[in-house]
């Protein structure tokens, strides 16, 4: 995970009342105990700050030490600051925990920019606003880092929720969620509702605000509207999926679908942007520029560098197109599409112009490591990581930012042939040559 581009975390706007339960769609499988319904104690358990990550409160050790931990579906290590650092208000003090066990093994994680390194151990871990359980989990105690912690972000560690295959130093280090499922009766599933406010928040607003929900072990119906649509997890390492078609304002980009997944497509809560392979990014930007051609913006804006500002309340959302990603469905030759608005892919930025302005960065960027469906995508949807059934579900989030004319959408089914051909098969490489990070 590279923290140069972190996700925007802003307060949720509304949503269904907690008591409201939407009727189950007729095409859904029968309910299973513990998988669906109300998870009141876990709703609204995420917080954060624009561009700096969604975090959950966790406790580590005995007696419990409370830390805020970044929720990251793009990595697989549970790692926490364990030494003083200028950007940390607090850190994990192993010597104060009677249940800490040293694994006598180091771990070093380099990123495209920056790195962290530390010492491996295990300790007792729980999530106060999560399931009422305590588990013994692997912990990387970060003793040294560079460009990893973010000044003012208010989190002190990272919870990697992906699979063991990408854990460091190797896949023998069991990730937290695997430990949780093994040691408790928590179902092998979690779901995320990341709520973007649509406007920047200052530090005090962030601390008082809701950033979303991480529902561990189930699905909460109050967090979404309409139906959940599922796409298969192609391979259990990252949360890899297959994109079969891309449209800008309904216009097909008309690329070989392999390009959309070159060299993979992943769902990653630890990345701010929607990141696209070079060829796809260029085609998408060309199409977005054409759709919004009544106004022109500098190249630096499309590179995600420059901010564009409008007088407060006058952002011309209507000139920017919607973006649809078609994902492989669970049924042969069937796909569904998720559609995001400019309210998701234009990221509000604080403290730059005057208070009379609304300023934004373009939050779609180029990738050399495949498509990354970061917060730009996830803030539009309630996303179910159904590990038990090796699938990821998408439904329209009850807290997504929209206007009176358009809304994010999850729609299907669509007939799409030869979807398996859209997946890219990465040549086997010596693991030491793989580059970690999300630049």
């Amino acid at each position: 995970t590279q923290h140069g581009i972190r996700l925007p975390l802003r307060s949720g706007l509304g949503g269904a009342p907690l008591g409201l339960r939407l009727p189950r769609e007729t095409d859904e499988e029968p309910e299973e105990p513990g998988r669906r319904g109300s998870f009141v104690e876990m709703v609204d358990n995420l917080r954060g700050k624009s561009g700096q990550g969604y975090y959950v409160e966790m406790t580590v050790g005995s007696p419990p030490q409370t830390l805020n931990i970044l929720v990251d579906t793009g990595s697989s290590n549970f790692a926490v600051g364990a030494a003083p650092h200028p950007f940390l208000h607090r850190y994990y003090q192993r010597q104060l925990s009677s249940t800490y066990r040293d694994l006598r093994k180091g771990v070093y994680v380099p990123y495209t920019q920056g790195k962290w390194e530390g010492e491996l151990g295990t300790d007792l871990v729980s999530i106060p606003h999560g399931p009422n359980v305590t588990v013994r989990a692997n912990i990387a105690a970060i003793t040294e880092s560079d460009k990893f912690f973010i000044n003012g972000s208010n989190w002190e560690g990272i919870l990697g929720l992906a699979y063991a295959e990408i854990a460091r130093p190797d896949d023998s280090l069991e990730p937290f969620f695997d430990s949780l499922v093994k040691q408790t009766h928590v179902p092998n599933l979690f779901s995320l509702q990341l709520c973007g406010a649509g406007f920047p928040l200052n530090q005090s607003e962030v601390l008082a605000s809701v950033g979303g929900s991480m529902i561990i072990g189930g699905i909460d119906h109050s967090l979404y509207t309409g139906s959940l649509w599922y796409t298969p997890i192609r391979r259990e390492w990252y949360y890899e999926v297959i994109i079969v078609r891309v449209e800008i304002n309904g216009q097909d980009l008309k690329m070989d679908c392999k390009e959309y997944n070159y060299d993979k497509s992943i769902v990653d809560s630890g990345t701010t942007n929607l990141r696209l392979p070079k060829k796809v990014f260029e085609a998408a930007v060309k199409s977005i520029k054409a759709a919004s051609s009544t106004e022109k913006f500098p190249d630096g804006f499309w590179l995600g560098e420059q901010l564009v500002c409008w007088q407060a309340g006058t952002t011309p959302w209507n000139i920017f197109p919607v973006i649809s990603l078609y994902l492989m469905g669970e049924v042969t030759n069937q796909s569904f599409r998720i559609t995001i608005l400019p309210q998701q892919y234009l990221r509000p930025v604080e403290d730059v112009a005057t208070s009379q302005d609304d300023c934004y960065k373009f939050a779609i960027s180029q990738s050399s490591t495949g498509t990354v469906m970061g917060a730009v995508i996830m803030e539009g949807f309630y996303v179910v990581f159904d590990r038990a059934r090796k699938r990821i579900g998408f439904a329209v989030s009850a807290c997504h930012v929209h206007d009176e004319f358009r809304t994010a959408a999850v729609e299907g089914p669509f007939v799409t042939l030869d979807m398996e051909d859209c997946g890219y098969n990465i040549p086997q490489t010596d693991e030491s040559t793989l580059m970690t990070g999300r630049a």
Epitope: F297, V308, C309
Partner: antibody
Framework: QLQLQESGPGLVKPSETLSLTCTVS??????????WGWIRQPPGKGLEWIGN???????YYNPSLKSRVTISVDTSKNQFSLKLSSVTAADTAVYYC????????????WGRGTLVTVSS | EIVLTQSPATLSLSPGERATLSCRAS??????LAWFQQKPGQAPRLLIY???NRATGIPARFSGSGSGTDFTLTISSLEPEDFAVYYC??????????FGGGTKVEIK
């Protein structure tokens, strides 16, 4: 080569509307490569951006002047114009029109400027 | 709002000397900064864009450097025609709006 020339009255009474026109010669105002803008400079002071316009009519204004400013474009005449309402002595300045080039980022070509005095 | 502070306000030098002008932004503007020269009774002229690129027709004695918050305009050897007021402008926040207060380079 492309040139810009401001024109309009040099004296405006307080509370009235200042009106200036910038004529583009030697090139088309309808070029998709440029925005066109107005900048002013009170006597002996620094530069203040007023606003920009694209040939399609899309405008951006300085928030501090927004309520009083209108910039418009007339592609048939290859001109763009500035109107500033309810003027006071503080609006006395040299007014420049300019081209926003280099990828819509930098004022790379300027008119010679015209002094507008607000006085009764 | 991003504020650009130029220093010194006045620089008194002789022809042939090296001039170093500073522009500091209140927060990072990456490399999105320009330098303009303005002579009395004339319109400003673009000298440098993107912090270090010389505009068309600008002599090589003018150079720009810096990124983030600190920027420098250097005139390696002052010519008589270089005595003027110099302004910086940031375009990190678009549309371009913020100019610095200016530095006057005068003959000593």
């Amino acid at each position: 080569q492309l040139q810009l020339q401001e024109s309009g009255p040099g004296l405006v009474k307080p509370s009235e509307t200042l009106s200036l026109t910038c004529t583009v010669s030697g090139g088309s105002i309808s070029s998709s490569s440029y925005y066109w803008g107005w900048i002013r400079q009170p006597p002996g002071k620094g530069l203040e951006w007023i606003g920009n316009i694209y040939y399609s009519g899309s405008t951006y204004y300085n928030p501090s002047l927004k309520s009083r400013v209108t910039i418009s474009v007339d592609t048939s005449k290859n001109q763009f114009s500035l109107k500033l309402s309810s003027v006071t002595a503080a609006d006395t300045a040299v007014y420049y029109c300019a081209r926003l080039g280099h990828g819509y980022n930098y004022f790379d070509l300027w008119g010679r400027g015209t002094l507008v005095t607000v006085s009764s | 709002e991003i504020v650009l502070t130029q220093s010194p306000a006045t620089l008194s030098l002789s022809p042939g000397e090296r001039a170093t002008l500073s522009c500091r932004a209140s927060q990072s503007v990456s490399s999105y900064l320009a330098w303009f020269q303005q002579k009395p009774g004339q319109a400003p002229r673009l000298l440098i864009y993107d912090a270090s690129n010389r505009a068309t027709g600008i002599p090589a004695r003018f150079s720009g450097s810096g990124s983030g918050t600190d920027f420098t305009l250097t005139i390696s050897s002052l010519e008589p025609e270089d005595f003027a007021v110099y302004y910086c402008q940031q375009v990190y926040v678009w549309p371009p709006r913020t100019f610095g207060g200016g530095t006057k380079v005068e003959i000593k």
